[in-house]
């Protein structure tokens, strides 16, 4: 895990401010308004029956 | 480091009550998605209950098997995870087992707590 | 409910030795981008441990002969060349939609 600043996080995740390190963009789909989101590429919102079965 | 430690378990009558305890650390609890699972002695693994966050209003998701029998509850002020089992079966006698995520992949694991149902 | 089909539920192998366990899903738990299964560990009396999230991201401090892949319904994990302290219980696991299902394990043991 990279610290801002030094080397972009690997491919297919993101930086959080939030919990200082990378986060995987895959859990977006998930969890949409965390913060690393904005810099995946494509997060799609999670579906309806997801959040809440 | 993360630890996750469970206690709480313990020898139950069929029918009775027991109340399961998670002390977590070394991560942002408050952050985080948790649930219990359990291992039946000799089996595989089962989903048992989850609990979101704050933001999620304390969003709660239970498997059928213990739905209206089973309650997951948390306080973030005290990093501790909740399982309030009623109704016990000789079926839920299992290791219980404390997980932490922040979505989908269980990162986190306590070590267990046996529950054992019977009379 | 998604059911998760593990195969094979045990094997005997040697050190050394390629190992590919099978899990297939009873639906897609996969998007266009990422797909929604993951792998732990086990050893006998101790917790599961994460190995692999999103089908083939390999979690911090996993050894890299540990290997994942598949995407739709079916996936598969693999220890290129197994060691004694691969000698364990391995479990597949979907996040697609509540309720969260397993696989029902596939034991390693030493042949």
């Known amino acids: 895990e990279q610290a801002p600043g030094t080397a972009p996080c690997s491919r297919g995740s993101s930086w959080s401010a939030d919990l200082d390190k990378c986060m995987d963009c895959a859990s977006c789909r998930a969890r949409p308004h965390s913060d690393f989101c904005q810099g995946c590429a494509a997060a799609p919102p999670a579906p309806f029956r997801l959040l809440w079965p | 480091q993360v630890e996750l430690v469970e206690s709480g378990g313990g020898l139950v009558q069929p029918g009775g009550s027991l109340r399961l305890s998670c002390a977590a650390s070394?991560?942002?609890?408050?952050?985080?998605?948790m649930s219990w699972v359990r291992q039946a002695p000799g089996k595989g693994l089962e989903w048992v209950a989850e609990?979101?966050?704050?933001?999620?209003?304390?969003?709660?998701h239970y498997a059928e098997s213990v739905k209206g029998r089973f309650t997951i509850s948390r306080d973030d002020s005290k990093n501790s995870l909740y399982l309030q089992m009623n109704s016990l079966r000789a079926e839920d006698t299992a290791v219980y087992y404390c997980?932490?995520?922040?979505?989908?992949?269980?990162?986190?694991w306590g070590q267990g707590t046996l529950v054992t149902v019977s009379s | 409910d998604i059911q998760m089909t593990q195969s094979p539920s045990s094997l005997s192998a040697s050190v050394g030795d390629r190992v590919t366990i099978t899990c297939r899903a009873s639906q897609s738990v996969s998007t266009s981008s990422y797909s929604y299964m993951h792998w732990y560990q086990q050893k006998p009396g101790k917790a599961p441990k994460l190995l692999i999230k999103y089908a083939s991201n390999l979690e911090s401090g996993v050894p890299s002969r540990f290997s994942g892949s598949g995407s739709g319904t079916d996936f598969t994990l693999t220890i290129s060349s197994l060691q004694p302290e691969d000698f364990a219980t391995y479990y597949c696991?979907?996040?697609?939609?509540?309720?969260?299902?397993f696989g029902g394990g596939t034991k390693v043991e030493i042949k």
């Open positions: 609990i979101r966050l704050k933001s999620d209003n304390y969003a709660t």
């Open positions: 997980t932490g995520y922040y979505a989908d992949a269980m990162d986190y």
């Open positions: 696991q979907h996040s697609w939609e509540i309720p969260y299902t």
């Open positions: 070394g991560f942002t609890f408050s952050s985080y998605w």
